[in-house]
Structure formats: structure tokens, C-alpha cells
Amino acid sequence: QPDAINAPVTCCYNFTNRKISVQRLASYRRITSSKCPKEAVIFKTIVAKEICADPKQKWVQDSMDHLDKQTQTPKT
């Protein structure tokens, strides 16, 4: 079993200051660890690049909503 206590924590220290087109986004994950200085969202792009974003920004919230919606739509 992996040792969860020693598992590395991913944190975001800076946020992107550019709005990313939802067409470029593949997925997201939230960073909520108390060990991190900021709550954050990490978007993964379709070319597997990871970008830190501020969850308080509306475009970030809208992008998360868009990606959530995609999980409900069967891909054919």
C-alpha cells in the first residue's frame, strides 16, 4: 500500500493571467490541500500541459462547468 502520509502534494503558487479557450481543455482537478498556500484548479490541456488557475475567476468556474457537462455526454 502506498504511504499516503508521505505522498507528494501538488500546489499552485501562481495563476495564469490568460483566459484559456475551453476547446483547449481536456480535464481539471482541484487543489484543496491545507498544505498549499492557495486553493487552485489545475487544468490539463488537450496537449497534456497543466495550468494553474484561480477558482474564484468566472472563466475558471465556467470552464469547470463545461468540462463537468462533458462527463455526462456519452462520446460516440
Epitope: 480535464s27 484543496t32 486553493e39 462547468d65
Partner: nanobody, 123 residues
Amino acid sequence: EVQLVESGGGLVQAGGSLRLSCAASGRSFSSHRMGWFRQAPGKEREFVASISRSGENTYYADSVKGRFTISRDNAKNTVYLQMNSLKSEDTAVYYCAASGGMGISAPNSYAYWGQGTQVTVSS
């Protein structure tokens, strides 16, 4: 960290209505998709309804469509579940949840949970 407290449950007759509320405290409420789930005795926790961060998109389990309405007030950090035309099969503990990852109806896409409020529908 997000703390969630549900209220509004109780005993109601079949055909009646209840409005559940879920008050959130902690980090940015508007950055979380919110959902309601329920768990009846001896059954697994099941998805009831979910609302997007903007409040523009709502999703419902087939069993509650047309009877239940989810809404949110980001200024008050509160999400609501209006339940009409209640049936005995709606009897359960109702849980409010805040998202932790991608997804809409899967319980494991919600990271934060309230303690639940009991809804009992008598026939």
C-alpha cells in the same frame, strides 16, 4: 475546506412539499458545483440533483424529474432543494455535497458532504 449544514427535513404526508436548504461556509462557494444525494435505509447513497457553479445548468435523477427543483444563491452561500409531490419512496436522509473534481452525478466527484437531514414521507 468547505463546511455544509443541511436543514428543512421532516415528516410530511404523501403529495406534500418540503424545501431543503444547505448553508456553506469556508472557501469560495461559487467555485463549487453543488449536489443533493439521498440514502434510504439499507440502500446505497444515490444522486438526486446537481447545479452548476453559475446556476444555469441543473441535472436530476429520473426518479425526481418534474417534482424536485435545485437552485442556489451564491450571495447567501446556500443551495436549495424544493421537493413537491413527495412519495413514500422519497423517504431517506438527504445530503448536500460540494464538488471536488470533474463530474456531475458520481458521489466520488464530490469532496465535501454535510451530515444529512431526514425526510420521511408517510402514506
